[in-house]
């Protein structure tokens, strides 16, 4: 709601005239009256509205972890396998198919 | 109404470990994240960590790893604090408190806390 | 690490006085500080969160204002029942930090 959006952005999203609330993953950009995609400014001092996003962003550059919005933090999947969220599949899976638990080949 | 109700006072010996739990109702367990605060005899506020009720994951200061694990029981909405190899300097009130997701509840910050648990670590 | 410094540690005054204290973060961390107060023998509350925004039910004599670096925190027209220790925090970025405190004695 715009309530919402108000009380958890009062900064970088007021236009003057309205609120305009962007996809997560993008800031309004008052100048250029549009959203802007956050990855833009994520080497910059960030926008609060894209500070969740950029960290997120760096988090999956490192291997066999994911960003947790509830935590707001990179954690190690490697600590949660077996009840892993979908951003940890890949690794968690592969953790499991890894040659010491492979059959032999016939 | 949101409750979070911690375990009593306890009185250990150094090197021991001790398990402090955190009893919450009145809200949705998973969708919070639960964390714990130390607050030495008369300073301030210090977090220790938190974790995700979801699947466990945790995130800890980095003065707290190999102090403090966090653990829950998403069957009874419980919330665990362990701290172990305890010295006099461990001897403190730790509160739990619980924080929402920052995009889907409006984010309130640490909104409720528990009534703390004093640990006091003595020969 | 962000580290907050909060001043002053101390403040003494009168029921009906104005009172402010500040806080200041090592970097910027947007408007993400939360005001917290603690009574005795009481476990901590929230008052203010985002910088400026007050929670379900705080009394509007406490208001919380800045951006960036520099916050601070007022209470208008001190009442009694205030009497507590005010602390703020960054909630920008993991670990999360609080301020030293600020203990309000009422004369």
């Known amino acids: 709601s715009r309530v919402d959006q108000e009380e958890r952005f009062p900064q970088g999203l007021w236009t003057g005239v309205a609120m305009r609330s962007c996809p997560e993953e993008q800031y309004w950009d008052p100048l250029l009256g549009t959203c802007m995609s956050c990855k833009t400014i994520c080497n910059h001092q960030s926008q609060r509205t894209c500070a969740a996003f950029c960290r997120s962003l760096s988090c999956r550059k490192e291997q066999g972890k994911f960003y947790d919005h509830l935590l707001r933090d990179c954690i190690s999947c490697a600590s949660i396998c077996g009840q892993h969220p979908k951003q940890c599949a890949y690794f968690c899976e592969n953790k499991l198919r890894s040659p010491v638990n492979l059959p032999p080949e016939l | 109404e949101v409750q979070l109700q911690q375990s009593g006072p306890e009185l250990v010996k150094p090197g021991a470990s001790v398990k402090i739990s955190c009893k919450t109702s009145?809200?949705?367990?998973?969708?919070?994240?639960m964390h714990w605060v130390q607050q030495s005899h008369g300073k301030s506020l210090e977090w220790i960590g938190g974790i995700n009720p979801n699947h466990g994951g945790s995130s800890y200061n980095q003065k707290f790893k190999g102090k403090a694990t966090l653990t829950v029981d998403k069957s009874s909405s419980t919330a665990y604090m362990e701290l172990r190899s305890l010295t006099s300097e461990d001897s403190a009130v730790y509160y739990c408190a619980r924080r929402g997701d920052y995009y889907g509840n409006l984010y309130y910050a640490m909104d409720y806390w528990g009534q703390g648990t004093s640990v006091t670590v003595s020969s | 690490s962000i580290v907050m410094t909060q001043t002053p540690k101390f403040l003494l005054v009168s029921v009906g006085d104005s009172i402010t204290i500040t806080c200041k973060a090592s970097?910027?961390?947007?408007?993400?500080v939360v005001w917290y107060q603690q009574k005795p023998g009481q476990s901590p509350k929230l008052l203010i969160y985002?910088?400026?925004n007050r929670y379900t039910g705080v009394p509007d004599r406490f208001t919380g204002s800045g951006y960036g670096t520099d916050f601070t925190f007022t209470i208008t027209t001190v009442q009694a029942e205030d009497l507590a220790v005010y602390f703020c925090q960054q909630d920008y970025s993991s670990p999360w930090a609080f301020g030293g405190g600020t203990k309000l004695e009422i004369k």
């Open positions: 009145g809200y949705t367990f998973t969708e919070f994240s």
């Open positions: 970097q910027s961390v947007s408007n993400d």
């Open positions: 985002y910088a400026s």
